[in-house]
């Protein structure tokens, strides 16, 4: 059997660190057998059999010029084997980030904090932290560790399914290469990393007869499990076209009537979601939806009997993906925020 331990990585490759002494091992001989070493394709003897180093070649302070293929030969000239030297660095602790889009599952992504230049893999696991007292922790079989299953196709991500919302978890991501291993431990709680996906299906409609109103409605994100105990709250922003500043409201449910829209101008609307007890953070904003308030007009015929009534001028505008080009004419009621004059009323 070979005297050379096989490091993790492709066969026939041995590894070292730049600036450090590197030992290469001749794989096809018995431990201690004297061998001669050559660079592949070069006749010059690097180290003879009388070096006293047996089956090993020592390179002091290796650098990039030492990378490549080496050949070792036994005393009778037989090929002892070929070895490829690759230089790189031991792993540094990876950087890990975890996020949850719902209260039952979370995922963790990672990235190397330093590029080792060597073949690298990652081991991912987690355990549930059980806290006994003020500052004591106990490990029991029921708390893991369990593997954190990694995404296929090599994405640097693993997912924990069926997590407990009120529990703390310790994530272990270990970077492994032929020169060693380095572990990042990250403590996470679902409550702190919860960030829902943005609400879906945002629609913006005019309110017939009310030229300063818009009705926005939306639904829960599809990723949010349908259970009554974990609700979402929402934040809605709106602004007229060409206005830089957003107005913000916190609707009570899945709908909001905007009462101070600028008549005649298209408005952008977007919504964000958060756990209703303020766990975690707000979602990103939904894609903007656009709508224009209806323009009320005086009807052509006034009924014979005296009556106060309102009449819409246009059909509601739903969910248009891009804003209609607004008129560049200044609007006479741009700064009018009074709801009391909103209705277009005719008294017979």
């Amino acid at each position: 059997s070979s005297p050379c331990p096989q490091a993790w990585g492709p066969p026939g490759v041995q590894y070292g660190q730049p600036g450090r002494s590197v030992k290469l091992c001749c794989p096809g001989v018995t431990a201690g057998d004297p061998v001669s070493w050559f660079r592949d394709g070069e006749p010059k003897l690097l180290q003879g059999p009388d070096s006293g180093l047996g089956h090993e070649l020592v390179l002091a302070q290796a650098d990039s010029t030492d990378e490549g293929t080496y050949i070792c030969q036994t005393l009778d000239g037989a090929l002892g084997g070929t070895v490829t030297l690759q230089l790189g660095y031991p792993p540094a602790r990876p950087v890990v980030s975890c996020q949850a889009a719902d209260y039952e599952n979370f995922s963790c992504t990672w990235s190397p904090s330093q590029i080792s230049g060597l073949p690298t893999r990652y081991l991912t696991s987690y355990r549930k932290k059980t806290v006994l007292g003020a500052d004591s922790q106990r490990r029991s079989p029921s708390t893991g560790p369990w593997p954190c299953p990694q995404d296929p196709l090599g994405a640097a991500r693993c997912v924990v399914h069926g997590a407990e919302f009120w529990s703390q978890y310790r994530i272990n991501v270990t970077e492994v290469n032929p020169l060693g291993a380095s572990t990042r431990l990250l403590d996470v709680s679902l409550q702190s990393i919860l960030r829902p996906d943005p609400p879906q299906g945002l629609r913006v409609e005019s309110v017939p007869g009310y030229p300063r109103r818009l009705r926005a409605s939306w639904t829960y994100p599809a990723s949010w499990p349908c259970q009554p105990h974990f609700l979402l709250k929402f934040r809605l922003q709106y602004r007229p076209a060409q206005h830089p500043a957003w107005s913000t409201v916190e609707p009570a449910g899945l709908e909001e009537v905007i009462t101070d829209a600028v008549a005649g101008l298209p408005h952008a609307v977007r919504v964000s979601a958060r756990d209703f007890l303020d766990a975690g953070t707000w979602s990103t904003w939904s894609p903007e939806a656009w709508g224009t308030p209806s323009t009320g007009t005086i009807p052509k015929e006034i009924p014979a009997w005296g009556q106060l009534h309102t009449q819409p001028e246009v059909e509601p505008q739903v969910d248009s993906p891009a804003p209609p080009r607004p008129s560049l004419q200044p609007h006479p009621r741009l700064l009018d925020h009074r709801d009391s004059v909103e209705q277009v009323a005719v008294l017979a």
């Epitope: 950087v95 890990v96 190397p112 330093q114 590029i115």
Partner: antibody, heavy 118, light 107 residues
Framework: EVQLLESGGGLVQPGGSLRLSCAAS????????MTWVRQAPGKGLEWVSS????????QYADSVKGRFTISRDNSKNTLYLQMNSLRAEDTAVYYC???????????WGRGTLVTVSS | DIQMTQSPSSLSASVGDRVTITCQAS??????LNWYQQKPGKAPKLLIY???NLQTGVPSRFSGSGSGTDFTFTISSLQPEDIATYYC?????????FGPGTKVDIK
């Protein structure tokens, strides 16, 4: 020569923006995490933000989260810090620093002074 | 965040004296502690990494020890060029934090 050189500092009004750059030379920039650390006049060192070699993960101090954005261009060997909604308390010398790894800083630039004042 | 405290905040010593600075973390940081030297008007310089490892090119009179929450930095024989502020810094957490610093000058 192995070095880091910051630029982009200056005087800015509260609420304003500034973009700092850090040019790296003499080492394989794309192989290391990079960091911004700041030091207010007469005060200690405060970590601001770090970014991994591939640029896909970043971290920020709570004091700058949502206002500052760290980024890097490995093809230009340059680190950036976009600073928005600046406040008087952001006044400091801003240093860029190189790993090894994440959170150790074995190479520092000379720093660039950012003054936020009206 | 992990809080770092240092003591003393300043000290004066004679050339040749042994100088000791302590650093305490608010929670266990294993050995993930670095020491930096900053001279007036200059950028910080890494002296000791991971509690006890001397950075390449740093004189051997500087040393560090400790693990967990309590750490010590020592200058075995103070030299005039050692006048500076010394900072400890943890990197156990992905949000590194520095101690407030210890200013060292010559009596």
């Amino acid at each position: 020569e192995v070095q880091l050189l910051e630029s982009g500092g200056g005087l800015v009004q509260p609420g304003g923006s500034l973009r700092l750059s850090c040019a790296a030379s003499g080492f394989t920039f794309s192989g290391y995490s990079m960091t911004w650390v700041r030091q207010a006049p007469g005060k200690g060192l405060e970590w601001v933000s770090s970014i991994v070699p591939y640029g896909d993960l970043t971290q920020y101090a709570d004091s700058v989260k949502g206002r500052f954005t760290i980024s890097r261009d490995n093809s230009k060997n340059t680190l950036y810090l976009q600073m928005n909604s600046l406040r008087a308390e952001d006044t400091a010398v801003y240093y860029c620093a190189k790993g090894p790894g994440w959170g150790s800083f074995d190479l520092w630039g000379r720093g660039t002074l950012v003054t936020v004042s009206s | 965040d992990i809080q770092m405290t240092q003591s003393p905040s300043s000290l004066s010593a004679s050339v040749g004296d042994r100088v000791t600075i302590t650093c305490q973390a608010s929670q266990d940081i294993n050995n993930y502690l670095n020491w930096y030297q900053q001279k007036p008007g200059k950028a910080p310089k890494l002296l000791i990494y991971d509690a006890s490892n001397l950075q390449t090119g740093v004189p051997s009179r500087f040393s560090g020890s400790g693990s967990g929450t309590d750490f010590t930095f020592t200058i075995s024989s103070l030299q005039p060029e050692d006048i500076a502020t010394y900072y400890c810094q943890q990197h156990e957490s992905q949000s590194p934090t520095f101690g407030p610093g210890t200013k060292v000058d010559i009596k």
